[in-house]
Amino acid sequence: VPPGEDSKDVAAPHRQPLTSSERIDKQIRYILDGISALRKETCNKSNMCESSKEALAENNLNLPKMAEKDGCFQSGFNEETCLVKIITGLLEFEVYLEYLQNRFESSEEQARAVQMSTKVLIQFLQKKAKNLDAITTPDPTTNASLLTKLQAQNQWLQDMTTHLILRSFKEFLQSSLRALRQM
């Protein structure tokens, strides 16, 4: 159930509407819950989940990651720079979320929900950002060729790619939520 559509909301008509920050917080939590559900399926199917972070780091995926310069950490925190990084990162993750769409059997709907909820989250964050010009949108042609390349991998590499995308996306969202807690 997407955020804001649970029975508690229906049963409480006099509740204050969610603020922009609360809506973003709730949206990220919803996506993280979706990632947990997807990871249950991937971990049941392969032993990727037992692999160490270091072993998995030896890959060619250029997944978005928070760095000191992005202004999202406590030291050197910069609200606008950080917000731009969060939105840019989410836009970069979209191609990887598209790749995930055909990777699940029993959790097909959940994979779609994560993808659609991320699009909604990007919209929420874009409304919050003042400096939209600083946000670079990924090139569609580059994304299309990346998608083709990922889908052409052998089964083992596809399993590893799926696991890496989910884990990296989770860590990116957690870092985003930590940063948003300061805004």
């Epitope: 971990c43 989940c49 406590q74 930590r178 940063a179 300061q182």
Partner: antibody, heavy 124, light 109 residues
Framework: QVQLQESGPSLVKPSQTLSLTCTVS????????VGWVRQAPGKTPEWLGG???????SYNPALKSRLSITRDTSKSQVSLSLRSVATEDTAVYYC??????????????????WGRGLLVTVSS | QAVLTQPSSVSKSLGQSVSITCSGS??????VGWYQQLPGSGLKTIIY???SRPSGVPDRFSGSKSGNTATLTISSLQAEDEADYYC???????????FGSGTRLTVLS
Amino acid sequence: QVQLQESGPSLVKPSQTLSLTCTVSGFSLTSYGVGWVRQAPGKTPEWLGGIDRDGDMSYNPALKSRLSITRDTSKSQVSLSLRSVATEDTAVYYCARSSYDSHYYGDYYDVDVWGRGLLVTVSS
Amino acid sequence: QAVLTQPSSVSKSLGQSVSITCSGSNIGSSAVGWYQQLPGSGLKTIIYSTSSRPSGVPDRFSGSKSGNTATLTISSLQAEDEADYYCATGDRGNYGGVFGSGTRLTVLS
């Protein structure tokens, strides 16, 4: 109710591996993370590491090379393994449940319920 | 590693209120926990996620934070509150935790 219980040997020889198990009840390991903390006699507690509800581990950088945390969800158990122990690893070892919100923020050290603790002495 | 600073000891009379502070550069972006250790006993959570109280902990205990300082406040002090109190927060970058040096609370009668 929510309970965590540490078990394992109370005496370990130097250079050996310290292996402890935390058995939990009243909650599922696929809904909550579990962390390990130790406290040497008369000292401040030290966060060792944890495993979250997805099975992802995080470790204290100072101990990362010697430490391993695993889980068995079917047995509701989380295990800690500390290799090449020395006398300074003598401490009370606690397992604790990470708060529900910790999953969303990655605040795995943020714990709400503790085990009773187990004193492990490293001595020959 | 991040460093958390706490006063080493505080003393207050029975029935009074006391505030114990915890300062550190990483507190602003991380949750803060407060843990009580009675003499000869194990650790017990008094406050987690900065201001949440586990069930069974009296509402005399409250937690808050402002900037890089977190505060544990205990109102209507009782004799059984005499203990060591530790704060803990995140060590940025590895999702790990770091504990404060601890504060010994003495309740004067």
